[in-house]
């Protein structure tokens, strides 16, 4: 019974699984892109280092009405330890250039693939 209970109510998703699922979602977005992603919306680019997940969420959360990235927004919130709302930028987030969401997703995907290969799951 204990075993079945554990099966029915799984614990937290392992970081490696969560990262792989995020990568899969970003791959899905880039491959299924017909028209310009999010109508060509532009977001603040991010420094792909410390605090990357929160920074990515801070950028993408400002884009509304774009169903293609809603799942990504939800997944990124699982990697960010604090609540992020639109218009909120941490001190780590240097706003120096805006890029199209499609480019943002491609850049993020390349970096996450690199982290996954290197075994950096957090």
């Amino acid at each position: 019974l204990t075993c079945l209970g554990g099966f029915a109510s799984p614990g937290p998703v392992p970081p490696s699984t969560a990262l792989r699922e995020l990568i899969e979602e970003l791959v899905n977005i880039t491959q299924n892109q017909k028209a310009p992603l999010c109508n060509g919306s532009m977001v603040w680019s991010i420094n792909l280092t410390a605090g990357m997940y929160c920074a990515a969420l801070e950028s993408l959360i400002n884009v509304s009405g774009c169903s293609a990235i809603e799942k990504t927004q939800r997944m990124l919130s699982g990697f960010c330890p604090h609540k992020v709302s639109a218009g909120q930028f941490s001190s780590l987030h240097v706003r120096d250039t805006k890029i199209e969401v499609a480019q943002f997703v491609k850049d993020l995907l390349l970096h996450l693939k690199k982290l996954f290969r290197e075994g950096q799951f957090n």
Epitope: P36, C38, N39, G40, S41, M42, V43, N62, V63, S64, G65, C66, G87
Partner: nanobody, 116 residues
């Protein structure tokens, strides 16, 4: 319905100046960050500058820093871009945009041509 109407473009010699304007309607202008984006012939869209809702925060692409100034008049629902020391590489169609909304909410653009 969001409407953005740019004006002020034209032909100017290198080193010259132009002031672009963008009249906004259909949304509460003072509540939104606004962008200027440009597209040179045969190239992709390039972000130029952004301004926060109150106008106190501004950001610029490295390529225009020190030459362009973004501003806004919330009482007139108008966005501006003062462009000085213009170069041939500034030749493009300039669009004003409600930030984060995509080109479904952009204006029709105004053409800036820098040539001698």
């Amino acid at each position: 319905e969001v409407q953005l109407l740019e004006s002020g473009g034209g032909l100017v010699q290198p080193g010259g100046s132009l002031r672009l304007s963008c009249a906004a309607s259909g949304f509460t202008f003072r509540d939104y960050e606004m962008d200027w984006v440009r597209q040179a012939p045969g190239k992709g869209r390039e972000w130029v500058s952004s301004i926060g809702p109150s106008g106190s925060e501004t950001w610029y692409a490295d390529s225009v820093k020190g030459r362009f100034t973004i501003s806004r008049d919330n009482s007139k629902n108008t966005l501006y871009l003062q462009m000085n020391s213009l170069r041939a590489e500034d030749t493009a169609v300039y669009y004003c945009a409600k930030a984060y909304t995509g080109f479904g909410y952009w204006g029709q653009g105004t053409l800036v041509t820098v040539s001698s």
